[in-house]
Interface confidence: low
């Protein structure tokens, strides 16, 4: 009978160990091991036992002790398990960004290592346990899938091996993959909200609101808004789960018409859109022409209003007949007329809107100078030493200047408070006098003197 | 952090040649380097790769005609009776820590020329 | 045995352009596939890894996607600097299966 200690051996991949072989006679007449292994005999030995130092051992082997005794010839085999961790623990990438709600699979490759009956593989949640397969294969595949919340975002996962030889050599070896961080995002089914004029005048500024509710991470979300080729620059206002997006939109000429108004919300690899029309117009101020803005009374004076073909005008809040973008009406230039406003407004339907212009016109009329009873009394008796003030207003257009002199010389202070002498008594030649030419007017003051008793 | 090769130079076929590829600022127990070569105006080829804790792994066209060994600085490409077909410039890459993304190699040297010719 | 065959081997685009690289494995890698970029005389440069995860310091010009056999990279608004050789890479199994392997290149030349 032969015999070999250790039976059963596990060591490190690359390691040594020592082997009895002993016979059960004696002297045995051949006693030695057989092994592809590099081998060395550790001397001295005894009568009927050996010792070897087996080293490099890198695979899994059974060396087979054998002896030769006289009763026949014997052996026996040692188990000799090599062990070694994974060279490769990896997990598959994880997709740039996962749909909450969307089961996620994680996948994990893993190559070399053994004993495979001992090496198990785990995909982790951070330090949660997910999953727990055997290594099967070369490399190892293993996979599981998970659902995907909210809660998950920014989460590691990673996988990991454990080579378990606690029966044999009391230790447990782990090797762990690089973690993968998961993006998740949750964008709701429902389209953002888009509120902007339904209409836009060229060359005014507009102001467009896009926002949509129920987005995660909000923060992550990026909004596109754009006028037709005009791509838009928004303020983004963040709300716990929603987003308003806030920009000034200026249209030109050339793109007058209908144009689509683009408002996406993308967040991860997902996109929510909502259009909108938006009717670009131009409508300049109707024109308002006198034939002359300024002319001399009794004048006639042709007071015309003009606006876009579409349009339909009122002037001076008369509508034109037939309605329509032209109207004007004659007048006959009056004193009154002076400083007169001609008005006009302009309606015009864009899109179903009505949208409405004016322009105003002043008429500056010429007359005088006037010197009137009413206004320049030719007559006037004070008492002495009374206070008066003199009253004497010269009409017309331009204004004239006035002048109130006795003798050539002697001035009447009109619109001064004076105490009324004798001197002021007198016949006044009054003279208005403008650009336009010059009037007189005769004025008498005549002083009451008082009674003596 | 940077790696460079040495050792490359004409050969006669048959002979034997050993490329040295020496890195700095990082620990090769931690990384797993690999050898890519590449023939004049040709593509890349991966010939194979050295794990963080010594073991050697190679393409099935390079099993028996190259071997990868290390120490504490440097990864060895040896390359045993070598024919005109290995004229290349050999470059050392180096894969991710601790066996993770082994093959993707994301710092190389600038390489080092061998010319295989009698 | 396992192959990576990329089409095109060249391609030829102006400024400002855009160009897309096919790479075909020819069995699933999942998304085990990286890109590089090697310009004359230079070591090859990690561009894109995990088919369509952008390396530090990496141009987002660049746009690798793709999973299972089929992957593409694409070059958008090119620049002078973009002419180089491409090539993509798995790294799915072992090296005796597709650990490593690399595609046989595609010239991109700026015109």
């Known amino acids: 009978q032969t015999s070999v200690f250790p039976p059963e051996v596990i060591l490190p991949r690359g390691g040594s160990v020592k082997v009895n072989c002993s016979a059960s006679c004696d002297q045995p007449i051949s006693l030695g091991m057989e092994t592809p292994l590099p081998k060395k005999e550790i001397l001295p030995g005894g009568n009927n036992w050996k010792m070897y130092e087996l080293s490099n051992v890198q695979e899994d082997s059974q060396p087979m002790c054998y002896s030769n005794c006289p009763d026949g010839q014997s052996s026996a085999k040692t188990l000799l398990t090599v062990y070694w961790t994974p060279e490769r623990v990896e997990l598959a990438p994880l997709p740039p960004w996962q749909p909450v709600g969307k089961n996620l699979t994680l996948r994990c490759q893993v190559e070399g290592g053994a004993p495979r009956a001992n090496l198990t593989v785990m995909l982790l949640r951070g330090e949660k346990e997910l999953s727990r397969q055997s290594a099967v294969g070369e490399p190892a595949e293993v996979t599981t899938t998970v659902p995907v919340g909210r809660d998950d975002h920014g989460a590691n996962f990673s996988c990991r091996t454990e080579l378990d030889l606690r029966p044999y050599v009391l230790k447990l070896f782990e090797n762990t993959s690089a973690p993968h961080q998961l993006q998740t995002f949750d964008l709701p089914a429902t389209p953002p909200q888009l509120v902007s004029p339904q209409v836009l005048e060229v060359d005014t500024q507009g102001t467009v609101v896009c926002s949509l509710d129920g987005l995660f991470p909000v923060s992550e979300a990026q909004v596109s808004l754009a006028l037709g080729d005009q791509k838009l620059n928004p303020t983004i206002t963040y709300g716990n789960n929603s987003l308003s997006a806030k920009a000034s939109v200026k249209v030109t000429a050339e793109e007058e018409g209908t144009q689509q108004l683009l408002c996406g919300v993308m967040l991860g690899n997902q996109t929510q859109e909502t259009r909108q029309t938006v009717t670009i117009y131009s409508f300049p101020a109707p024109n308002v022409n006198l034939t002359k803005p300024e002319v001399s009374e009794g004048t006639e004076v042709i007071v015309e209003c003009e606006a876009h073909p579409r349009a339909k005008v009122m002037l001076n809040g008369v509508p034109a007949q037939p309605p329509g973008p032209r109207a004007q009406f004659l007048l006959k230039a009056t004193p009154e007329d002076n400083g007169r406003s001609f008005s006009c407004s302009a309606t015009l339907e864009v899109a179903g809107q009505l949208v409405h212009k004016n322009q105003t016109r002043e008429l500056r009329v010429l007359y005088g100078p006037r010197l009137d009873e009413k206004d320049c009394p030719g007559n006037w008796t004070w008492p002495e030493n009374s206070q008066q003030t003199p009253m004497c207003q010269a009409w017309g257009n331009p204004l004239p200047q006035l002048k109130c002199l006795k003798d050539g010389t002697f001035p009447l202070p009109i619109g001064q408070s004076v105490t009324v002498t004798r001197d002021l008594e007198g016949t006044y030649l009054c003279q208005a006098r403008s650009t336009r030419g010059e009037v007189t007017r005769e004025v008498t003051v005549n002083v009451l003197s008082p009674r003596y008793e | 952090q940077s790696l460079e090769e040495s050792g490359g130079r004409l050969v006669t076929p048959g002979g034997s040649l050993t490329l040295t590829c020496t890195v700095s600022?990082?620990?090769?127990?931690?990384?797993?380097m690999s050898w890519v070569r590449q023939a004049p105006g040709k593509g890349l080829e991966y010939i194979g790769w050295?794990?963080?804790?010594?073991s050697a792994y190679y393409a099935n066209w390079a099993k028996g005609r190259f071997t990868i060994s290390k120490t504490s600085t440097t990864v060895d490409l040896k390359i045993t009776s070598p024919t005109t077909e290995d004229t290349a410039t050999y470059f050392c890459?180096?894969?991710?820590?601790?066996?993770?993304?082994?093959?993707?190699?994301?710092?190389w040297g600038p390489g080092t020329l061998v010319t295989v010719s009698s | 045995a396992f192959e990576l065959t990329q089409t095109p081997s060249s391609v030829e685009a102006a400024v400002g352009g855009t160009v897309t690289i096919k790479c075909q494995a020819s069995?699933?890698?999942?998304?085990?596939l990286s890109w590089y970029q090697q310009k004359p005389g230079q070591p090859p440069k990690l561009l894109i890894y995990?088919?369509?995860t952008l390396a530090s310091g990496v141009s987002s010009r660049f746009k690798g996607s793709g999973s299972g056999t089929e992957f593409t990279l694409t070059i958008s608004d090119l620049e002078s600097a973009d002419a180089a050789t491409y090539y993509c890479?798995?790294?799915?199994?072992?090296?005796?299966?597709?650990?490593?392997?690399f595609g046989g290149g595609t010239e991109v030349v700026v015109k």
């Open positions: 890479q798995s790294y799915s199994g072992t090296i005796s299966t597709s650990g490593g392997a």
């Open positions: 050295i794990s963080f804790s010594g």
């Open positions: 069995e699933s890698i999942n998304s085990y």
């Open positions: 995990a088919a369509s």
């Open positions: 600022g990082f620990s090769l127990s931690s990384y797993g």
């Open positions: 890459a180096r894969g991710g820590d601790y066996g993770g993304s082994t093959y993707i190699l994301n710092l």
